[in-house]
């Protein structure tokens, strides 16, 4: 019987109850490999999930997330709520990024602005909740007598500490 079962292709299961060994996977089920004793029930893309690829006799359904949510985990096993740029998702919902941090996506966490001074550079463009700072030439490059084609960095807004 084992040898006969190995002849059953994807889309079938090896049916011990019948002389006709390879039976079709019934509706809403599939087998993606040959020689299966049972067919797996198709994944249902319901609620916050929507169908990206419908289930067939030989492959499972694939889900995406509905608008306003994004996939997490292998094969989109979870859907997480989107936030706006400049926000992060907390247990209490979407919250604005704290001062000194930013998030340029609808998902993920707020990350600290780049510390330009660590690379010996100065802040060329200030950071916002949605965007990281842009680092420019080092202050030494901008000292009198230094030849540079780069214009001097704009004055920082009050309250923005040097990076």
């Amino acid at each position: 019987l084992q040898d006969l079962c190995s002849n059953c292709p994807a889309g079938t299961f090896c049916d011990n109850n019948r002389s006709q060994i390879c039976s079709p996977c019934p509706p809403n089920s599939f087998s993606s490999a040959g020689g299966q004793r049972t067919c797996d029930i198709c994944r249902q893309c319901k609620g916050v999930f929507k169908t990206r690829k419908e289930c067939s006799s030989t492959s499972n359904a694939e889900c995406d997330c509905i608008s306003g949510y994004h996939c997490l985990g292998a094969e989109c096993s979870m859907c997480e709520q989107d936030c706006k740029q400049g926000q992060e998702l907390t247990k209490k919902g979407c919250k604005d990024c704290c001062f000194g941090t930013f998030n340029d996506q609808k998902r993920g966490i707020c990350r600290p602005w780049t510390n330009c001074s660590l690379d010996g550079k100065s802040v060329l463009v200030n950071g916002t909740k949605e965007r990281d700072v842009v680092c420019g030439p080092s202050p030494a490059d901008l000292s009198p007598g230094a030849s540079s084609a780069t214009p001097p960095a704009p004055a920082r807004e009050p309250g923005h500490s040097p990076q």
């Epitope: 059953c8 994807a10 889309g11 390879c22 079709p24 019934p26 067919c39 067939s56 030989t58």
Partner: antibody, heavy 117, light 112 residues
């Protein structure tokens, strides 16, 4: 969207054979079981059998073994059913249908086969 | 073979009425996987049959919610809560749990 387009009506002589086609569009043809159904006036609907085009595996209702033969061409996305040794009992409308959430989730428009001397 | 018996053979109704069609199988139609593959189809004159209900009680996409299916074991029912003109035709039950898969003889829904 899923569509099954069947070949046109056939007028056949007793003892002859006929090959009906079912062209599939709108889905991955090789991955779904395709079913065949017979409908005769006064006899209702009868399941003939099925084929999985990707592997060519087919199953038949015992009643139609030796009468119907299923084949499929995955390059043209077309399934075929050949009916042999035709008699007046084979005069019917034949449908192809695709498995989905049910055994016959999507149907072709049907092919009328008339067997007459 | 599993015999599927539908009653009544003909069902005259007035538009807006409720209609109920019974389907009885000659044996239990639970599949080896535990599911019951009992389906209902509607065939309008000159058309192919169309799927209405699958696995006893699930409405197929696009099927109005006035259609409902119920039952278990060997006794199944299709109900139409308020019959509309577009519902007229022949209704078939079908079992796909045992080979050969078999249809009921049909119930013709017609105007009284």
């Amino acid at each position: 969207q899923v569509q099954l387009q069947q070949s046109g009506a056939e007028l056949m002589k007793p003892g002859a054979s006929v090959k009906i086609s079912c062209k599939a569009t709108g889905y991955t043809f090789s991955s779904y079981w395709l079913e065949w159904i017979k409908q005769r006036p006064g006899h209702g609907l009868e399941w003939i059998g099925e084929i999985l085009p990707g592997s060519g595996v087919s199953n038949y209702n015992e009643k139609f073994k030796g009468k119907a033969t299923f084949t499929a061409n995955t390059s043209s996305n077309t399934a075929y059913m050949q009916l042999s040794s035709l008699t007046s009992e084979d005069s019917a409308v034949y449908y192809c249908a695709r498995l989905g959430l049910a055994w016959f989730a999507y149907w072709g428009q049907g092919t009328l086969v008339t067997v007459s001397a | 073979d599993v015999l599927m018996t539908q009653t009544p053979l003909s069902l005259p109704v007035s538009l807006g009425d409720q209609a109920s069609i019974s389907c009885r199988s000659s044996q239990n139609i639970v599949h080896g996987n535990g599911n019951t593959y009992l389906e209902w189809y509607l065939q309008k004159p000159g058309q192919s049959p169309k799927l209405l209900i699958y696995q006893v009680s699930n409405r197929f996409s696009g099927v109005p919610d006035r259609f409902s299916g119920s039952g278990s074991g060997t006794d199944f029912t299709l109900k139409i809560s308020r019959v509309e003109a577009e519902d007229l035709g022949v209704y078939y039950c079908f079992q796909g749990s045992h080979v050969p898969r078999t249809f009921g003889g049909g119930t013709k829904l017609e105007i009284k």
